[in-house]
């Protein structure tokens, strides 16, 4: 492996080299670990309610988007997947499964259909969808 | 891979880790860890040579696709990114940075442009591209 010094001088790049390597997790086996959160993408299509139960059965929740910085891997996600965001008709707000309110400017909410559930799509977009429609889904487990 | 028990004693944490949960890595800080491989997606566009050097400077290589099963997270990647696959004009084969030959049926190679480098695109597709064209890139580090 060429030294970073030599490479930097060669290409005149200012590449910052991480000083440390670290372990990520713990996560369920074969889940994606990123910034100590665990993610899994499920291929089988389920409605929102079954997707929620499936995540719960794996000691997780449907995806919660809480930070563009900590979750920047989500920018590159292809397709549409159920996340844990639901519309509360009584007060018109969007909230996560834990009851916390969707922070402003985190997601661009797009009305694709009439519905009370939301699909995550790349670049931090949320598509409103009927909760009964089957879709793939993303489960997430936050490590302590 | 260090056992959860050892990690807990090392960091003096009193965390009970379910048997089905495990740590992933080690990886450079803030990289994605999946099935004990480390990945990072770089936003800045560089040509293939600069992308290769950037990965090397971080003790990594451009993405090597070696298993659809172990790297199934790549199915969901949006957009096009340089990977470590190059065309060898002398024998017409495609090979990785480490000199290994591209295994059959791993990638669908699509000729987008005349070129000797390849962009990774979702669902295990490889797009042939001129190595001098700037693109985003994926670095990968395999843990031992």
């Amino acid at each position: 492996i060429w030294s970073a010094v030599f490479l930097n001088s060669l290409f005149n790049q200012e590449v910052q080299i991480p000083l440390t390597e670290s372990y990520c997790g713990p996560c369920p086996k074969n889940w994606i670990c990123y910034k100590n959160n665990c993610y899994q993408f499920f291929n089988e299509s389920k409605n929102w309610y079954e997707s929620q139960a499936s995540c719960m059965s794996q000691n997780a929740s449907l995806l919660k988007v809480y930070s563009k910085e900590d979750q920047d891997l989500l920018k590159l996600v292809k397709s549409y997947h159920w996340m844990g965001l639901v519309h509360i008709p009584t007060n018109g707000s969007w909230q996560w499964e834990d009851g916390s309110i969707l922070s402003p400017n985190l997601l661009t909410i797009i009305e694709m259909q009439k519905g009370d559930c939301a699909l995550y799509a790349s670049s931090f977009k949320g598509y409103i969808e009927n909760c009964s429609i089957p879709n793939t889904y993303i489960c997430m487990q936050r490590t302590v | 891979i260090w056992s959860a028990v050892f990690l807990n004693s090392l960091f003096n944490q009193e965390v009970q880790i379910p048997l089905t949960e495990s740590y992933c890595g080690p990886c450079p800080k803030n990289w994605i860890c999946y099935k004990n491989n480390c990945y990072q997606f770089f936003n800045e566009s560089k040509n293939w040579y600069e992308s290769q050097a950037s990965c090397m400077s971080q003790n990594a290589s451009l993405l090597k696709v070696y298993s659809k099963e172990d790297q199934d997270l790549l199915k969901l990647v949006k957009s096009y990114h340089w990977m470590g696959l190059v065309h060898i004009p002398t024998n017409g084969s495609w090979q990785w940075e480490d000199g290994s030959i591209l295994s059959p049926n791993l990638l669908t190679i699509i000729e987008m442009q005349k070129g000797d480098c390849a962009l990774y695109a979702s669902s295990f597709k490889g797009y042939i591209e001129n190595c001098s064209i700037p693109n985003t890139y994926i670095c990968m580090q395999r843990t031992v």
Epitope: N47, W48, Y49, E50, Q52, A53, S54, M56, S57, N59, W96, E97, D98, G99, S100, C131, S132 | -
Partner: antibody, heavy 121, light 107 residues
Framework: QVQLLESGPGLVKPAETLSLTCTVS??????????WDWIRQPPGKGLEWIGS???????YYDSSLKTRVTISVDTSKYQFSLRLSSVTAADTAVYYC?????????????WGQGTLVTVSS | EIVMTQSPDFQSVTPKEKVTITCRAS??????LHWYQQKPDQSPKLLIK???QSISGVPSRFSGSGFGTDFTLTINSLEAEDAAAYYC?????????FGPGTKVEIK
């Protein structure tokens, strides 16, 4: 108005299998947002969740009972059932069936009247 | 599993008094906490869902609050018909668990 009614034997011998059925009336068992549950309450004690089922047949069980419990659904009969094998006196309880209306994290909004099952020889 | 604790175990209260029952979860459960009332020889009845959401048909004297690990059920002006056991229930993760209950008696 949805109503739930438990039925099954009130007395079961030790080591045998307890079988109960819950019949749903006044509503659909296949509504996409509904989950159906079994909960029990030993005499003079608190409530214990046994498990949930969705109309598709997906089940979710309490880990301490997992090896002994089976919950199934028969959508054509508007029924879901509980089977608990190898019972002991500790399984003596009032058994309730209940519903979550809007997904599995929702509260139990409708309960059956409960049926007392005694485990004794 | 998430362990739910309730206090007090027992409360003897005079009519029109305010009653406060607390429920604590062993880890954060967001607002996935529900309250039930159970009268002798009856099945439980839902009072409050998602920590603070009122239920149609439940008298307005019943209210709930809290988020995370600490929750409260308040009966604003106790009536004789409120003599019952009160249970909290977490639906945040499997297995679902209930608090041990608080018995409210009318003096």
């Amino acid at each position: 108005q949805v109503q739930l009614l438990e039925s099954g034997p009130g007395l079961v011998k030790p080591a045998e299998t307890l079988s109960l059925t819950c019949t749903v009336s006044g509503g659909s068992i296949t509504s996409t947002s509904y989950f159906w549950d079994w909960i029990r309450q030993p005499p003079g004690k608190g409530l214990e969740w046994i498990g949930s089922i969705y109309h598709s047949g997906s089940t979710y069980y309490d880990s301490s009972l997992k090896t002994r419990v089976t919950i199934s659904v028969d959508t054509s009969k508007y029924q879901f059932s509980l089977r608990l094998s190898s019972v002991t006196a500790a399984d003596t309880a009032v058994y309730y069936c209940a519903r979550h209306e809007f997904g599995i994290r929702d509260a139990f909004d409708i309960w059956g009247q409960g049926t007392l099952v005694t485990v004794s020889s | 599993e998430i362990v739910m604790t309730q206090s007090p175990d027992f409360q003897s209260v005079t009519p029109k008094e305010k009653v406060t029952i607390t429920c604590r979860a062993s880890q954060s459960i967001g607002n996935n906490l529900h309250w039930y009332q159970q009268k002798p020889d009856q099945s439980p009845k839902l009072l409050i869902k998602y920590a603070s959401q009122s239920i149609s048909g439940v008298p307005s004297r019943f209210s709930g609050s809290g988020f995370g690990t600490d929750f409260t059920l308040t009966i604003n002006s106790l009536e004789a018909e409120d003599a019952a056991a009160y249970y909290c229930h977490q639906s945040n993760s499997f297995p679902f668990t209930f608090g041990p209950g608080t018995k409210v008696e009318i003096k």
